[in-house]
């Protein structure tokens, strides 16, 4: 028998820094979690420990922090080649920078091979983008070998801007002549590296033949065996047992998010390259382990240009941004309509003729909205202004819900209007009227939402049996403000961007700004 | 203190093959990637790949990609480099370097190996 | 491949000079991983100046190093007979790693 040792990241949404318990900015740093200084310690550890070691990572490195906002990947290839991780999957926003964002500061500078099978590109690019990325590596590991798959949401031109010269194809389809091409050069220990989903990482090893692992990313699944030892609450046990069409236990892992915890899973294989056991946990990287003095010390270097950045003018508004809760918890307000728009401006994805985009609207809870921006400063606006007003490192998910669903929320906005709740709704591309003359539950009286599917956007009355897409804050997606009825009903979730990066990326294109109160939410005569 | 010692002068004909050894101390050899670095008389340094000695996993120069092995022993924390099929363009001092892990510079050398190729 | 081109490939100079070697790289090299290297006859090379401008342990303050992109520099701000050696710079920001072919510096 043969082990070898699976260390495994995915999501790290670029927290190189500690952070706190919910993975946001480390306040106390004596319970703080996570970051590449802590991660290093700990990697190291299991290396000196142990033979067989793999460190692996299943992509959505990028985007995440004012890390990434400012070195743009650089800092990923930086610290995962300091880390010596051993190969790395494609994730969808890996391509939030477009197709050369990923090329030059990530694809040409990282020492260990970044792999998606599904991935094929086409056009120019082909030949720009050929050997940069591949789609299976196979990794001499001790006095075996180990194929490496790896694959990538086939959702990332909805969710990500990776250009028209990439075809995300389906990710069985495309692994399956992978795999068997690494069973023609004798590799019989197969890793499926990548970045779908826990639903995708469990059909694929249910369905493509000769995967023997499967370490997965993008749902932020927490697996753990035992007792949890933070917050998370475990989707099952780690590792998840697949049984496979052809009757093998195939082993899936994700290892939650934002560098939190490391995966760690030992298996052992006959010498045929059968999975014999299969055992592990995530190690959850808290202050109990010691941050490497000579990583922290580079961090450190690196963040002084951090500090200068979140000083400098992204734009200018030549109008008050009314962020108050006064304004934001009541009524429509001018900052909420900034922000909505601009994450319907962050989701722009021509990718069908028959629509004008494939998501039109925006929901914000007005609580999220924690303070003004005073015009009076020369106009100015800095990421320091903004990260006042988004100061909890959220993101701007895609979700996908009925207008049933939709309705109820909206009910919820105002079910305790006047009591400064912070589940009031801010809107984009969508039209509301209310009536607080109403009972609680009953009071929406009129709910339009923008079409995507045309030519001239214009507003139509919400229909209950429709499925819609909407950009809204994580916080809202997991049911924040008691908004339990988009977590229960929600037909499909995408994690986005950083919610401060969405913004400050608008307000920097747009160059100056003067969002107002236009008339996106209303009140019926009498009641207001 | 660190350091990294080398075995001896090599002496080998065209087409044969050569391995040469690399016993560190002084630090953890599963630390740090060990690289070699080939340099024929009077001319600059060339990169032929690295090790991560924790897990055996290489990266070679393509130029030398298929002729050159490396390994390692962690028991004894010795790198080894293997060179087939030499030629007499082989001739060279060969040296293991250790490289720094977050700017890759080569900290510490070895005294290299002398390989002459010669019929 | 990142080919690095160092110049001049050799130069006399005299104590208390001060010399200035470049290196040029073929495309956009970060500042982080550009190296320089001293080897003197008969001995490996070592460890000069890392990251452009970080001198390596015991090196001497009258070496300095500078520049970004494609163009780097190693300054002596005053010549010693010691210095008169070969230097190289090396770039690892891309794979394959690279090598300038040296300056050789020796006494007029």
């Known amino acids: 028998a043969w082990e070898l040792t699976i260390l495994h990241t995915n999501d790290v949404h670029s927290r190189l820094e500690q952070t706190s318990e919910d993975s946001s900015k480390c306040v106390n740093a004596s319970r703080c979690m996570g970051g590449v200084a802590r991660l290093f310690t700990k990697v190291q550890q299991i290396r000196r420990a142990e033979p067989n070691v793999l460190l692996l990572d299943a992509g959505d490195q990028y985007q995440g922090t004012i890390w990434f906002t400012v070195y743009k990947g650089a800092e990923v290839a930086h610290f995962m080649n300091a880390l010596r991780y051993d190969a790395m999957a494609l994730g969808n926003h890996e391509f939030d920078n477009g197709v050369e964002g990923l090329i030059e500061p990530l694809l040409k500078e990282a020492k260990f091979p970044i792999l998606s099978a599904n991935i094929k590109a086409k056009g120019p690019l082909a030949s720009q983008i050929s050997g940069l990325y591949l789609p299976y590596k196979v990794l001499p590991v001790g006095d075996e070998v180990v194929g490496i798959v790896g694959y990538t949401s086939k959702e990332t031109p909805f969710l990500s801007n990776p250009g028209t010269n990439l075809v995300f194809e389906d990710e069985i389809t495309a692994l399956q002549p992978e795999v068997d091409k690494l069973k023609t050069l004798n590799v019989n220990k197969i890793i499926a590296l990548g970045h779908s989903g826990f639903e995708m990482d469990k059909l694929i090893a249910q369905k493509v033949r000769g995967v023997d692992v499967v370490v997965g990313g993008h749902s932020n699944t927490f697996l753990y065996t035992g007792n949890p030892p933070s917050k998370e609450v475990p989707a099952g046990k780690y590792p998840f047992i697949v049984t496979s069409d052809d009757g093998r236990k195939v082993p899936v892992v994700q290892a939650y998010a934002f560098g939190k915890y490391l995966g760690y899973l030992k298996i052992e294989f006959d010498e045929r390259g059968n999975v014999i056991s299969s055992h592990g946990n995530p190690i959850l990287l808290n202050s109990s382990i010691p941050e490497d003095p000579s990583i922290k010390a580079d961090i450190n270097k690196w963040r002084i240009k951090l500090d200068n950045y979140s000083t400098q003018e992204l734009g200018k508004t030549i109008v008050y941004l009314d962020g108050s809760s006064q304004s934001c918890r009541f009524r429509e307000c001018n900052m909420g309509n900034l922000i909505c728009d601009a994450m319907i401006n962050n989701n722009l994805r021509h990718t069908d003729e028959m629509f004008w985009n494939h998501v039109s609207m925006c929901i914000l809870n007005g609580g999220g909205i924690r303070s003004p921006i005073d015009e009076r400063n020369n106009g100015t606006i800095t990421w320091e202004n903004l990260a006042a007003v988004l100061p909890f490192g959220g993101t701007f998910d895609l979700v996908q819900l009925k207008g049933s669903t939709l309705k109820k929320a909206f009910e919820h906005s105002v079910h305790r209007y006047g009591q400064s709740t912070g589940e009031f709704l801010q809107v984009g591309g969508i039209h509301v009227v209310y009536d607080l003359s109403r009972k609680p539950g009953d009071r929406v009286v009129k709910l339009d939402v923008l079409c995507t599917k045309c030519r001239v956007p214009s507003y139509d009355p919400l229909k209950m049996d429709e499925v819609y897409k909407v950009i809204l804050p994580n916080f809202l997606a997991n049911g924040g403000d008691g908004f339990q009825m988009i977590k229960d009903e929600l037909l499909r979730h995408d994690s986005g961007d950083q919610d401060i990066n969405v913004v400050s990326t608008y307000i920097s294109k747009m160059k100056v700004i003067y969002p107002a109160v236009e008339g996106r939410i209303k009140f019926s005569t009498g009641s207001h | 203190q660190v350091q990294l010692v080398q075995s001896g002068a090599e002496v080998k004909k065209p087409g044969a093959s050569v391995k040469m050894s690399c016993k560190a101390s002084?630090?953890?050899?599963?630390?740090?990637?060990m690289h070699w670095v080939k340099q024929s008389h009077g001319k600059s340094l060339e990169w032929i790949g690295y090790?991560?000695?924790?897990?055996?996993?290489?990266t070679y120069n393509p130029k030398f990609e298929g002729r050159a092995t490396l390994t390692v022993d962690t028991s004894a924390s010795t790198a080894y480099m293997e060179l087939r099929s030499l030629r007499s363009e082989d001739t060279a001092v060969y040296y293991c370097v250790r490289s720094d892990f977050l700017y890759w510079y080569f900290d510490v050398w070895g005294q290299g190996t002398t390989v002459t190729v010669s019929s | 491949d990142i080919v690095m081109t160092q110049s001049p490939s050799s130069l006399s100079a005299s104590v208390g000079d001060r010399v200035t070697i470049t290196c040029t790289a073929s495309?956009?090299?970060?500042?982080?991983?550009l190296h320089w290297y001293q080897q003197k006859p008969g001995s490996s090379p070592k460890l000069w100046i890392y990251s452009t401008s970080n001198l390596a342990s015991g090196v001497p303050g009258r070496f300095s190093g500078s520049g970004s992109g494609t163009d780097y520099t190693l300054t002596i701000s005053s010549l010693q007979p010691e210095d008169f050696a070969t230097y190289y710079c090396?770039?690892?920001?891309?794979?394959?790693?690279?090598f300038g072919a040296g300056t050789k510096l020796e006494i007029k």
């Open positions: 090790i991560k000695p924790h897990n055996a996993g290489t």
């Open positions: 090396h770039q690892y920001h891309r794979s394959p790693l690279t």
């Open positions: 495309s956009s090299v970060s500042s982080s991983y």
């Open positions: 002084g630090y953890t050899f599963t630390d740090y990637n």
